[in-house]
């Protein structure tokens, strides 16, 4: 059980207050993290509170401002990027969000040597992506779906691609589905380590069906947003990878990298690109039926001016029990010999672990093992490998950082973080400087987050970078709910749950229960992290018990749990939420007449299905931006878990797993359905179809749409949303306003 913060003296209680909804909506209790912007082994940049860009040298202890807030303000810059030769800084302004990661911006180049903005050959606007080469100060950028290269910031640009067209051909940036479901980045170009080559992806969306929705705006006529968006079973983007020599790009031009024959034989995806050296690159490909992934190592042949990907350097990763990888196929981390690498994939017992691949995957050497999972490889140096896992004390929702000494035999393992601030910190990430000389640890909880700087050799803490003192002080007179993370054992399935309990929780009393669910494949909700959010308020002020349950399909507990939902979405995720609720009722402090469930996105799908399960457990529930049929969602995501919606594949379950098929079952629950009309991700279509089915079944329900809002329902919509949902729940639970 974690109590945050501990309450020792009862005399303090009368000076303390509960959280308010206003606190949550104002972000009163938000925390800060500190991620150094590393620029060498011992130096990093950080934007100070007053917006100066400051360079810190850990070894000398000195710091100085490289770019003043005055310069930043002169172009309204909200972001910056220092060139590796430290001669120039790009300043980013006019940020305009597109999708989850993508945005356009205006860029200005500032010359640090003369203290002036570079004039002549200025960058066009708006730019879709811009980055420095890893060495020197070459610039690559994407403008109007084409890639351009500048040898120096003041030089004229060289146009690398010419076929870029809005919504048709994307060069150096992903289309919608690759951005959201495959790359999880706004870019699709990669510099080689010393900047000799530039690799990029070209996505051809010419044949992809288009999702069209109205954006109402303020004009007399709404405009129509068109996005090439492949839904399950539809035509997918066609991807090609090219590499161009950036020294003399006009000579040979872009060279296409060949696709492995076993991948090219049917529909496929490109999943990631990793440079190994300036003349060796590693590409990962995935069959459309996402249980086969191929890692292909390609070498530059100077005499042929081409990229050669020999079959002997193809490594196949295949899943026989589910899909390849976790959420994504993991990426390799190459060792210093520039051919062998470390990679996370399932071991023979079905747990994701680090393996060392020297020649073939079959001969891989397993580096970590156990009934827990390795989650991320942060850095490999000559003698150490740093990774995170949830091994410590067998809590899947924790993250600790480990170091394995790979320079010695047998390799020894050390937990770097397990005992640092044990009560406060059980969920870490890390950020390493060059050669791992130093690293920052960012602890997310369960206590108040703290960021610290450490020596990469000794692991000694050097200084606290951010400890959220103001937050700590602000929380001193707040009655925070109690949180506990425990597990249920049901039919050989372990269901971890987090329970958020009212501050004066009394086991002998009865409380309304709200289940918050996400439940998507390879997700995890039960995590040892700090949060003061809406559900904290509901427990603190409104006296609700809130529970989050990680059921089948969730991550980091082995393939048996993860792949249980393969080809059967919408079944076990719902069953496990229901099972958990029954167990919570058995605990004796839940008012079984006042149980609700809510979720967003995949969670909206699960909450809808749970409400329509016919169990009679739930009095009411909320679905925010739910998926309602897997035929309406993106191909890359959906088919990974469901296969294709064709008769000879999995059409039957696509049809059986819709929310609409259960319309009749909503008759005995109070249902609040919420969706943004400009949701590019889970289209409004999903909720429109639920609403239509409920109307056709003559089932009463409540609904709220948010005009021109996307999947995030941000800005003023957030306030309206949480206020509206609060009223709905309080009414459902008969709580007075």
């Amino acid at each position: 059980i974690v109590l945050r913060p501990s309450r020792v003296h009862n005399s303090e209680e009368n000076t303390m207050r509960a959280l308010t909804l206003k606190d949550i909506l104002n972000g009163t209790f938000s925390y800060k993290t500190f991620f150094p912007n590393w620029i060498s082994g011992q130096e990093y940049l950080h934007q100070s509170a007053d917006n100066n860009i400051v360079l810190y040298n850990i070894e000398t202890g000195q710091s100085y401002t490289i770019l003043s807030n005055r310069t930043m303000k002169s172009v309204n810059a909200s972001n910056y990027g220092l060139s590796p030769d430290r001669q120039f800084v790009y300043l980013e302004s006019d940020y305009s969000k597109l999708w989850r990661y993508s945005y356009t911006a205006t860029y200005y180049i500032y010359d640090l040597s003369n203290g002036e903005f570079v004039r002549g050959n200025e960058l066009p606007r708006p730019i879709q992506y811009l980055c420095w080469s890893p060495v020197g100060s070459k610039l690559a950028y994407v403008y109007q779906n084409n890639i351009y290269l500048k040898q120096r910031p003041g030089d004229p640009p060289f146009q690398i691609t010419f076929n870029g067209r809005e919504n048709k051909i994307f060069n150096g940036i992903p289309d919608w589905v690759y951005e959201e479901e495959m790359l999880a980045t706004k870019y699709a170009l990669w510099w080689s380590p010393n900047g000799k080559f530039l690799a990029y992806a070209e996505f051809n969306d010419t044949d992809i069906p288009v999702i069209a929705y109205s954006y109402y705006g303020d004009e007399q006529y709404p405009r129509t947003i068109n996005i090439p968006y492949p839904k399950a079973g539809a035509k997918n983007p066609v991807v090609r990878i090219f590499i161009i020599d950036t020294t003399y790009p006009a000579y040979v031009g872009p060279q296409e990298v060949p696709v492995p024959a076993m991948i090219a034989s049917s529909d496929y995806y490109f999943s990631w690109l990793t440079w190994v050296t300036d003349e060796r690159v590693c590409l990962q490909w995935l069959k459309r039926v996402q249980n086969v992934s191929v890692l292909s190592i390609c070498d530059f042949r100077e005499d042929w001016q081409t990229w050669d990907c020999p079959k002997t350097q193809e490594h196949i990763e295949e899943s026989r029990t589910g899909w390849a990888g976790g959420f994504f196929v993991s990426t390799p981390v190459f060792s210093y010999d520039a051919i062998s690498y470390y990679k996370i994939f399932s071991d023979k017992d079905g747990y994701k672990h680090i393996h060392y691949i020297k020649d073939t995957v079959e001969n891989a050497i397993q580096i970590t093992s156990g009934k827990w999972e390795a989650i991320n490889i942060f850095r490999v140096t000559q003698d150490s490998l740093f990774y995170s896992s949830n091994e410590f004390e067998e809590y899947p929702g924790r993250r600790n950082i480990y170091r394995i000494s790979i320079g010695s035999y047998p390799p020894s393992k050390k937990c770097v973080t397990c005992h640092l601030r044990k009560e406060r910190c059980q969920y870490y990430t890390a950020s390493f400087s060059d050669y791992a000389k130093y690293y920052a640890l960012v602890c997310y909880g369960p206590g108040i987050p703290i960021s610290t700087l450490h020596d990469g050799r000794t692991d000694q803490e050097i200084k606290i970078l951010e400890e959220n003192k103001e937050l700590e002080n602000a929380l001193k007179n707040i009655q925070l709910p109690k949180e506990e993370i425990k597990k249920l054992e049901v039919d050989e399935i372990t269901l971890w749950y987090k329970m958020i309990l009212p501050p004066q929780f009394d086991r002998s009393k009865k409380y309304p229960l709200l289940i918050q669910v996400y439940g998507g494949p390879c997700s995890q909700s039960v995590r040892s992290v700090f949060a003061v959010n809406w559900i904290s308020y509901l427990a603190s002020k409104e006296g609700m018990v809130i529970a989050l349950v990680d059921g089948r399909g969730t991550a980091f507990q082995g393939d048996k749990l993860l792949y249980a939902v393969y080809r059967k979405l919408g079944v076990y995720e719902v069953e496990d939420q229901i099972t958990a609720v029954r167990k919570f009722i058995e605990m004796g402090f839940i008012d079984e007449k006042r149980i609700a469930i809510w979720g967003w996105s995949y969670g909206g799908y699960v909450s809808s299905l749970a409400l329509a399960s016919g169990t009679g457990l739930f009095k009411c529930g909320i679905a925010v931006a739910p998926v309602s049929s897997w035929e309406y969602y993106a191909s890359v995501y959906t088919e990974r878990f469901m296969g294709l919606p064709t008769k000879d594949d999995n059409l039957e379950h696509y049809k059986n797993s819709t929310v609409m098929a259960r319309a009749e079952y909503f008759r005995n629950v109070d249902y609040l359905l919420i969706h943004g009309t400009a949701d590019d991700n889970v289209h409004f279509q999903n909720s429109a179809q639920i609403a239509k089915a409920l109307v056709n079944a003559q089932v009463d329900f409540q609904a709220m749409w948010y005009s021109d809002q996307n999947h995030g329902l941000s800005g003023l919509s957030t306030n309206h949303l949480y206020t509206h949902m609060t009223h709905f729940l309080k009414q459902c639970f008969s709580l007075s306003d």
Epitope: K150, A250, V252, P254, W304, Q305
Partner: antibody, heavy 117, light 108 residues
């Protein structure tokens, strides 16, 4: 050693068509972008067209756009220039050259195209 | 398009003399994209210099290139009899790739 050998030139009437070929050897043809550059009698050099190594991307000077088509057959190590709607001002020696937009490190000996009635 | 203007149009020099040929671009051209060629009567052009200053394979070191931005120079330190020809500069920064009108180096 790298060799480029053009053929297909000759006398053609205005409005007529001609197809030039360039046989390549001595290098991995499919790896390189290739170009056509022409030189009118007694005049300077003019870049006409280029094609990527795979043949997937083509580029043209405005003066020939819509009339000329560049293509290649990598299985035959051959570059082509299909010239339609020929005009008197297209009269020139046509060179095939190895490279995209430059530098052009190897050139053929050229083939003369004369457009005249 | 980028217009390259070469000067002088003709350069009359004796063997052993130094030749300096100029190429001016109508807009800035990064040095990576500037090349020089030599052409003799009845022959195809031959690459001399690429990247404004790098000599192509087999080109004698009496040929050198320099310059950046809009002004580029080809220098032949000591003219040999076989160097009398027409010289072209060329840019590959923009499509269309363009050539200068040429400088003829003739025997005085």
């Amino acid at each position: 050693e790298v060799q480029l050998l053009e053929s297909g030139g000759g006398l053609v009437q205005p409005g007529g068509s001609l197809r030039l070929s360039c046989a390549a050897s001595g290098f991995t043809f499919s790896s390189y972008a290739m170009s056509w550059v022409r030189q009118a009698p007694g005049k300077g050099l003019e870049w006409v067209s280029a094609i990527s190594g795979s043949g997937g991307s083509t580029y043209y000077a405005d003066s020939v756009k819509g009339r000329f088509t560049i293509s290649r057959d990598n299985s035959k190590n051959t570059l082509y220039l299909q010239m339609n709607s020929l005009r008197a001002e297209d009269t020139a020696v046509y060179y095939c050259a190895k490279g995209w937009l430059g530098p052009f490190d190897y050139w053929g000996q050229g083939t003369l195209v004369t457009v005249s009635s | 398009e980028i217009v390259l203007t070469q000067s002088p149009g003709t350069l009359s020099l004796s063997p052993g003399e130094r030749a300096t040929l100029s190429c001016r671009a109508s807009q800035s051209v990064s040095s990576s994209y500037l090349a020089w060629y030599q052409q003799k009567p009845g022959q195809a052009p031959r690459l001399l210099i690429y990247g404004a200053s790098s000599r192509a394979t087999g080109i004698p070191d009496r040929f050198s290139g320099s310059g950046s931005g809009t002004d580029f120079t080809l220098t032949i330190s000591r003219l040999e009899p076989e160097d009398f020809a027409v010289y072209y500069c060329q840019q590959g920064l923009n499509i269309p790739s363009t050539f200068g009108q040429g400088t003829k180096v003739e025997i005085k």
